[in-house]
């Protein structure tokens, strides 16, 4: 069963490490995917010092732990790197963080995947 | 720490229910997708079920479809498994496991028993 | 219906290297199966090793590596230690909701 579920068809793409990665620095990126397979948008980003500095934003793969997530919200308290995702064209344009008082360590922090 | 506890399980006849549970804790529940994973004796691992964040989105083996139902009380911080209609072929340790990104289960119950026999 | 096929069986000496594979009937696996391995000794829960290909698990040693090798997910055991043997599960993420085990490979340590 899944309620209420919105397809993810394009996000907003950001890549800090644009020049090194050569692709561009800012955009919309287009989700694609095998067609049985759903998509997300993500965001990745660093609290230095209170100033937020954005990783990457882009498409996600399938990945359950974003189903029905309409926001892109970070809750773990206080990662390295924080990390959230997202069902919805361009859910990832605003993102925030909620932390909710996670007491466990992650195996690791996500990165994006490779295409 | 992370601690996935399930109970429930025990000895039921052929067509009668359980209701499974799973207390997770050690981290932030509801914001964990969570699965539920069989072994049937001497057998290998089978995926059963598994849930999305809020519980509005559940999938099943096709073998169970029909028969359990997941769900969640993000305010319990609890999993549930509840099977119905059940089968000897169902006769298996249940673990309750969490999925963290890039869909994996990143820690494991100990499992309980299921048996179903006459 | 997608069938995901292990080695039933591996032997490997003590100190010695041993790659398992984990492959399916619908097409080559790749990383966006996001294969994860999992170990697993008579009557304890299983233990996570890799996910998402090739990133190890928090406190597993380095002798435990994930790769895809042509068509097939692996997992290579490198300086094999008696405690590694064990049965070992792969799991294909398929998608929407879906994953699907490996029938296993249970893993002799000669000697």
């Known amino acids: 069963a899944i309620l209420g579920r919105s397809e993810t068809q394009e996000c907003l793409f950001f890549n800090a490490n644009w020049e090194k990665d050569r692709t561009n620095q800012t955009g919309v990126e287009p989700c694609y995917g095998d067609k049985d397979k759903r998509r997300h948008c993500f965001a990745t980003w660093k609290n230095i010092s209170g100033s937020i500095e954005i990783v990457k934003q882009g498409c996600w793969l399938d990945d359950i732990n974003c189903y029905d997530r309409t926001d892109c919200v970070e809750k773990k308290d206080s990662p390295e790197v924080y990390f959230c995702c997202c069902e919805g064209n361009m859910c990832n344009e605003k993102f925030s963080y909620f932390p909710q008082m996670e007491v466990t360590q992650p195996t690791s922090n996500p990165v994006t995947p490779k295409p | 720490e992370v601690q996935l506890l399930e109970s429930g399980g025990g000895l039921v006849q052929p067509g009668g229910s359980l209701r499974l549970s799973c207390a997770a804790s050690?981290?932030?529940?509801?914001?964990?997708?969570m699965s539920w994973v069989r072994q049937a004796p001497g057998k290998g691992l089978e995926w059963v079920s598994g849930?999305?964040?809020?519980?509005?989105?559940?999938f099943y083996t096709d073998s169970v479809k029909g028969r359990f139902t997941v769900s969640r009380d993000n305010s319990r911080n609890t999993l549930y498994l509840q099977m119905n209609s059940l089968r000897a072929e169902d006769t298996a340790v249940y673990y309750c496991?969490?999925?963290?990104?890039?869909?994996?289960?990143?820690?494991w119950g100990q499992g309980t028993l299921v048996t179903v026999s006459s | 219906q997608t069938v995901v096929t292990q080695e039933p069986s591996f032997s490997v000496s003590p100190g010695g290297t041993v790659t398992l594979t984990c492959g399916f009937n619908?097409?080559?696996?790749?990383?966006?199966?996001?294969p994860s391995w999992y170990q697993q000794t008579p009557g304890q829960a299983p233990r996570t090793l890799i996910y998402n290909t090739n990133t190890r698990s928090s406190g597993v040693p380095d002798r435990f590596s994930g790769s895809i090798l042509g068509n097939k997910a692996a997992l290579t055991i490198t300086g094999a230690q008696a405690d590694d043997e064990s049965d070992y599960y792969c799991v294909l993420w398929m998608g929407s909701g879906i994953w699907v085990f490996g029938g296993g490979t249970k893993l002799t340590v000669l000697g």
């Open positions: 496991a969490k999925v963290y990104y890039y869909s994996f289960f990143d820690y």
């Open positions: 050690g981290f932030t529940f509801r914001n964990s997708a």
């Open positions: 849930i999305s964040v809020t519980g509005g989105s559940t």
């Open positions: 619908s097409g080559s696996v790749s990383t966006s199966y996001w």
